[in-house]
Amino acid sequence: DSSKWVFEHPETLYAWEGACVWIPCTYRALDGDLESFILFHNPEYNKNTSKFDGTRLYESTKDGKVPSEQKRVQFLGDKNKNCTLSIHPVHLNDSGQLGLRMESKTEKWMERIHLNVSERPFPPHIQLPPEIQESQEVTLTCLLNFSCYGYPIQLQWLLEGVPMRQAAVTSTSLTIKSVFTRSELKFSPQWSHHGKIVTCQLQDADGKFLSNDTVQLNVKHTPKLEIKVTPSDAIVREGDSVTMTCEVSSSNPEYTTVSWLKDGTSLKKQNTFTLNLREVTKDQSGKYCCQVSNDVGPGRSEEVFLQVQYAPEPSTVQILHSPAVEGSQVEFLCMSLANPLPTNYTWYHNGKEMQGRTEEKVHIPKILPWHAGTYSCVAENILGTGQRGPGAELDVQYPPKKVTTVIQNPMPIREGDTVTLSCNYNSSNPSVTRYEWKPHGAWEEPSLGVLKIQNVGWDNTTIACAACNSWCSWASPVALNVQYAPRDVRVRKIKPLSEIHSGNSVSLQCDFSSSHPKEVQFFWEKNGRLLGKESQLNFDSISPEDAGSYSCWVNNSIGQTASKAWTLEVLYAPRRLRVSMSPGDQVMEGKSATLTCESDANPPVSHYTWFDWNNQSLPYHSQKLRLEPVKVQHSGAYWCQGTNSVGKGRSPLSTLTVYYSPETIGRR
């Protein structure tokens, strides 16, 4: 059943004398493996013998391979899938039909393949895109229906016979579908490539020429133009004539329209290849070009810069920047239309020529107030001198100058006075709009630049003012020199450093923090009595009687100030102790007797000790000793001792007499 044999291979293979042919081939014999293979050249079926006749190029049997002449033909296949063949070298007389006679156990098949061998290497074929436009990348393809592993070839691209520098990509195909060698070249043609010959050259491995194909490039492009001008330098004076001519050096396809442009704008009614300009004016200066269009698009010539020369026009001055701040830099620019450009400038400040200033720009690195005013200039070129324009105004701004703070009051100023100050200045640009005062205070400003300080403080030492426009200028501080009575008067103990004990040497100092004027007098007083007129009050040996409230006074020509009352405390051991008895020193037995220890002490007595007539201490530590019920045996002399942090003091003896009650007497 012949339907069981399936073959795939190229229908026809191409080669040339001395080259080789590689035949990619696959098959499928579904009933079993291949047992016999014969390669025929132009096979013909013989009905008598039921066999094929023809030249046997290759034969393979179960017994083994039959060698072919010089091993020219090789079967590179296998028994079930591959039927690839190679003929190397191939000859002209190999052209025709190759027959592959396949036999398996039960089936036979004859597969035919066409072989076309030419005498000389056949040319490749160049493929071009349908249209080529300048600067648009295209791919040129060179195709050769040949490829063989045993015969390497190369394809080279030439432009007008010179190898092209662009890199080509060569690919080969040796598959059951196709056999070819292809070279692809990416290329961006320019208009100058139009009409040029491109060649694809087939070469062997050594670069020897085998064959080629050529094509002529048809590169579509916009018209390429040349512009010519009379006079050739395109420099004229007002009133002269100018002629410009437009020439087309190349156009594909043919051009259709012509126009002229000045500074990119189309000139009306100028549609010929010649542009005539009669009696030109300076306004006709500019860049001219011609534009010619075809189906691809418009082409433009290079620009011709027509210069119509004229004397400078009236100048204007540009100032960078006005208003200018004093100390900043300023640049003046003289602007005057002229052709050629001005070569010399004359500058004026307030109508007076500025010596040595001949440049287009004037630079003043450090502006001062006197630089203010009107600046103008005159420009000059080879055709004449321009007129002086209206000029520009430079405004120089600066902080207020020579600011001073002035005291309006008669001197001296006393604490509590109302002080008026004014803030004066010499000049200012812009005008002074406000004033500032240092230090800040809740002060009145009755009018601009005037400060009124009600009830001036003793510590208002200096005042400074600032006059302000966009900036503030501060005056040097002015001293108010306020006079005041002595301040912060206080009594300070100089010695002793610790607490004062009776008998100590004591010194008190009358201190004050400040006084203006500085000349002062001192007064000491205790309970309204004057004690001394020195800054110190001294006690050689202090006694408890010196304790009390002390004040000192300090006065100057403005007034006098008293200290706070200062308490002088003298510490002393208990003294003047005595025992008092209640209800009296004679008490009836059975009643209550209270003994009190009276004393004078600073600090007060912390505890007492009570003693009887035998100096035996009683277990009491309080000021009062209560005997209840009192007995006759309690009669006797008692004394007490008082103790504080300074020391001890004792009382003299006090006698308590306890007498019998009437009941006791009655019982006896």
Partner: antibody
């Protein structure tokens, strides 16, 4: 070593007299550097000083104001002891009664006697 | 009479804690203040006399300070045997008076 030994009834009828004795060993009731105290303790009143006796050149007594009209503390030099007498007792006098020596603080105490006033 | 006010009336503490008790007199008593410890069913025991003097045989962890009207009693590191009630007492004048006591309990 100084010791104080208390003696006396634990139950006293209301309006009767409470009598307790404190016997001293290791010290003298007539010592002139100490005082001999009676203190009682009850849940309602806490520690309450009642009075003291002490000898200097003669005998002295001090009593708390709350019991001044009912109390007597006597020294007995012959027996080296001191006693407490509290007249006209009421149930409020129910407490633990202590005797104590005072020499820079009460440094020696009796064992305490629980006295209940109940009819 | 001089009134002695003790605070707090009770406190809970752990072994090793520092415990402080204060006592205030209604008038100045100089340094005539004593501190006592009392355990249930026992008589009070003198610890400190005259505000800061340690009674013979009393451990040094007990201390006292103050004079005038304000006094402090401190146990620096509480021991298991220290859980008891503590009293202050003035010996400045008669009647002798005691504070209300501070009960130190185990936390």
């Amino acid at each position: 070593q100084v010791q104080l030994q208390q003696s006396g009834p634990g139950l006293v009828e209301p309006s009767q007299t409470l009598s307790l004795t404190c016997a001293i060993s290791g010290d003298s009731v007539s010592s002139d550097s100490v005082a001999w105290n009676w203190i009682r303790q009850s849940p309602s009143r806490g520690l309450e000083w009642l009075g003291r006796t002490y000898y200097r050149s003669t005998w002295y007594n001090d009593y708390a104001g709350s019991v001044k009209s009912r109390i007597t503390i006597n020294p007995d030099t012959s027996k080296n002891q001191f006693s407490l007498q509290l007249n006209s007792v009421t149930p409020e006098d129910t407490a633990v009664y202590y005797c104590a020596r005072d020499r820079n603080g009460m440094d020696v105490w009796g064992q305490g006697t629980m006295v209940t006033v109940s009819g | 009479d001089i009134v002695m006010t003790q605070s707090p009336s009770s406190l809970s503490a752990s072994v090793g804690d520092r415990v402080t008790i204060t006592c205030r007199a209604s008038q100045s008593i100089s340094s005539y203040l004593n501190w006592y410890q009392q355990k249930p069913g026992k008589a009070p025991k003198l610890l400190i006399y005259d505000a800061s003097n340690l009674e013979t045989g009393v451990p040094s962890r007990f201390s006292g300070s103050g004079s005038g009207t304000d006094f402090t009693f401190t146990i620096t590191s509480l021991q298991p045997e220290d859980f008891a009630t503590y009293y202050c007492q003035q010996s400045y004048t008669t009647p002798l008076t005691f504070g209300g006591g501070t009960k130190v309990e185990i936390k």
